[in-house]
């Protein structure tokens, strides 16, 4: 293109991209009609006075991944049409006051991944049209009152990955249009009452990976439009009774990686729209009746990696829409026969890595749609007659790592397993633990008459065959959380998170591990 600087490329006459280590200053001359300018991966260290003076039509300016550490206050003079400005991934420690003056059209300002130590009210006082402000990945230790007071149209504010130790209750008070507030990965220990009161349109609040110990009872009472609340990986040991009372729109709540010891009935709700509740990696020891009864639309409930030893028969009352229930890696020894009776739509249940010694025969009586059951690594010696008979959709059953007692009583189970082998998976099969002479042999192919020669056992297949459906998908829906590939973190749907890494260590957790928390 005629007019495109030699060290740049122009995919269109108005769109300039300048990249490479050989660039040490803003290239000149830039096309007078340039609408977008990208200066990426260069060795530019400073922006002097008015380097963009002759390109007043500029709409988008990206100066990213450079060595930029110093900007003159008048660097962006004459860019009244600029709507998008990114200075992300540079080495800025200080923003000059007045840098954004005159940028009356600015809507998005990206200052993430720099080394900013502080921001002041004067920095953004001219940016009245700003809708998105990204400050994550800096070294901010506090936000002064008034810093955002002029940003009344702001809809997204990201302050994640800084060093904030406290937040003033007044700092967000004028942000009535804010929809997304991210404060994850800071050092917040508590959040004062009233901090979020002005955020009446807030839809997402990300507070994960801080050091919050206590939540004020009315902290979220004004956030009636909140849909996603991330509180995972904090130090929360108890939940005030009314803390989640005013959140009718909430559909995702993450509380994993805290120090919760108990959940009192009524703590969650009413939340008629909650679809996902993540509570793994806490210290919960029991689940009382009706603890989740307000969550009529809940589909995913993750309670794994706690210390649950007792589940009240009515603990899961009200969860008629639940699809996934994860209870693995707890301290369960016994389950009441009615505990899952209300879960008519349950598809996947993970109970592995507990201490279950036996299961009631009616444990899955009303859960006809079950597709996956994880029972590996418990203390099961046998299972009641016909326990799986009615589960026509069952296509994944894990029974290995249990101390199966292969005497004559095991025959009905053995026969059923023989007829339903594909459901057991090919990786690990259940093996006998006793008697000693058959220890380690496959439960499916064991000859019980050899194992217990003195007992005559009639070959009666008391476990009628349940048809095997090879075409039935194990997990028909993408939100499914099977515990063989179980998510330990919900994929929190924004892009500032560390890359999600999958580790498939099935012998221990069999989960997807996300660094994000």
């Amino acid at each position: 293109y005629h007019g495109c600087p030699s060290e740049c490329t122009c995919s269109r006459a108005s769109q300039v991209e300048c990249t490479g280590a050989r660039i040490v200053a803003v290239p000149t001359p830039l096309p007078w009609n340039a609408m977008s300018l990208q200066i990426l991966n260069t060795h530019i260290t400073e922006l002097n006075e008015s380097p963009f003076l002759n390109i007043s039509a500029l709409i988008a300016l990206r100066i990213e991944k450079n060595e930029l550490s110093r900007i003159t206050p008048g660097a962006f003079r004459n860019l009244g049409s600029l709507r998008y400005l990114s200075l992300a991934n540079n080495k800025l420690q200080v923003l000059p006051i007045g840098l954004f003056q005159g940028l009356d059209s600015l809507e998005s300002l990206l200052l993430s991944s720099n080394q900013l130590l502080q921001i002041q009210p004067a920095h953004f006082s001219q940016c009245s049209n700003l809708k998105e402000l990204q400050l994550h990945g800096n070294h901010l230790e506090y936000i002064p009152d008034g810093a955002f007071d002029h940003l009344v149209g702001l809809t997204k504010l990201n302050l994640g990955k800084n060093s904030l130790t406290h937040i003033s209750p007044r700092v967000f008070q004028h942000l009535g249009n804010l929809q997304v507030l991210r404060l994850y990965e800071n050092r917040l220990t508590d959040i004062p009452m009233g901090t979020f009161d002005g955020l009446v349109n807030l839809q997402e609040l990300a507070l994960q990976q801080n050091q919050i110990g206590l939540l004020s009872p009315g902290l979220f009472h004004n956030n009636h439009n909140l849909q996603r609340l991330y509180l995972s990986n904090n130090h929360i040991s108890q939940l005030p009774p009314s803390v989640f009372m005013q959140l009718p729109q909430l559909n995702r709540l993450t509380l994993f990686g805290n120090s919760l010891k108990e959940l009192s009935p009524g703590i969650f709700g009413p939340m008629p729209n909650l679809r996902e509740l993540w509570l793994y990696d806490n210290h919960i020891s029991s689940l009382p009746d009706n603890v989740f009864s307000n969550l009529r639309q809940l589909q995913v409930l993750i309670l794994s990696r706690n210390q649950i030893s007792f589940i009240s028969p009515g603990a899961f009352n009200g969860l008629t829409e639940l699809r996934e229930l994860s209870l693995h890696t707890n301290a369960l020894q016994d389950l009441d026969g009615n505990v899952f009776r209300m879960l008519a739509n349950l598809q996947n249940i993970s109970l592995q890595n507990n201490r279950l010694r036996q299961l009631p025969g009616n444990i899955f009586a009303n859960v006809n749609g079950l597709m996956a059951i994880q029972l590996q690594n418990n203390q099961l010696e046998n299972l009641p007659l016909g326990i799986f008979d009615h589960l026509g959709k069952l296509c994944e059953l894990r029974l290995y790592d249990n101390p199966w007692r292969c005497d004559s009583d095991i025959l009905p189970l053995r026969n059923w397993l023989l007829l339903n082998q594909p459901r057991l998976g090919t990786d690990t099969v259940p093996v006998c633990f006793s008697p000693a002479n058959v220890r380690g042999q496959s439960l499916i192919i064991i000859n019980v008459n050899v194992a217990v020669p003195s007992v005559h056992v009639p070959e009666v297949p008391s476990y009628p065959e349940t048809p095997w459906y090879p075409d039935t998908p194990s997990y028909p829906d993408t939100t499914s959380v099977s515990s063989t590939t179980e998510l330990t973190s919900p994929v929190e749907d924004y892009t500032d998170l560390t890359t999600i890494q999958v580790t498939d260590d099935r012998s221990v957790w069999g989960m997807t591990q996300a660094q994000s928390g």
């Epitope: 269109r12 108005s14 609408m35 977008s36 990206r62 998105e132 990204q134």
Partner: antibody, heavy 120, light 110 residues
Framework: QVQLVQSGAEVKKPGSSVKVSCKAS????????ISWVRQAPGQGLEWMGG????????NYAQKFQGRVTITADESTSTAYMELSSLRSEDTAVYYC?????????????WGQGTLVTVSS | QSALTQPASVSGSPGQSITISCTGT?????????VSWYQQHPGKAPKLMIY???NRPSGVSNRFSGSKSGNTASLTISGLQAEDEADYYC??????????FGGGTKLTVL
Amino acid sequence: QVQLVQSGAEVKKPGSSVKVSCKASGGTFSSYTISWVRQAPGQGLEWMGGIIPMFGTANYAQKFQGRVTITADESTSTAYMELSSLRSEDTAVYYCARGVALLATDFDYWGQGTLVTVSS
Amino acid sequence: QSALTQPASVSGSPGQSITISCTGTSSDVGGYNYVSWYQQHPGKAPKLMIYEVSNRPSGVSNRFSGSKSGNTASLTISGLQAEDEADYYCQSWTHDNSVVFGGGTKLTVL
């Protein structure tokens, strides 16, 4: 080669909302404008709005302001267009489209289109 | 913003040349050299034929050319062929950083 793959056809009732997705592959997602263009049966093309995913904020045609929401998820390279308060006149094929530069002054790549039918 | 004005239909015989006009205002066509042209066959997505008034993307035949005078842009197709029969749309960048299309022109190859 850039590809834009859209979600499947939808049938909606008047007054409801529809959300159409557009997954991009074969190129950087974040630093290109994704626009949404619709075409009613037998009618012309109509630009609804666009978004540069890395900047997050969308730009809308005046006609659709307040009724359309365009968002982008950089982690999945997917753009979304949600249209609310549907009426029968919104029955159309909805296309996502992308240019070759940060700001799209023209559209080199198009999705296959998603038919949205609004009917009681 | 109002749609740009195009003739509803044009026709020509194989081998002939035809021109489709696209009229806007100084806020769109007249104010910027960002006029594009698209070809759309029935049931298919549009295809970019011309960008920035007169530039052709790679793979587009040089029988297609574009020009602009004042507030009116034009698409000329020379050596008309049967496969050129389609709908053609002009499109322009506008003063409020948005995009506007023309109403479309049906080209019939006789």
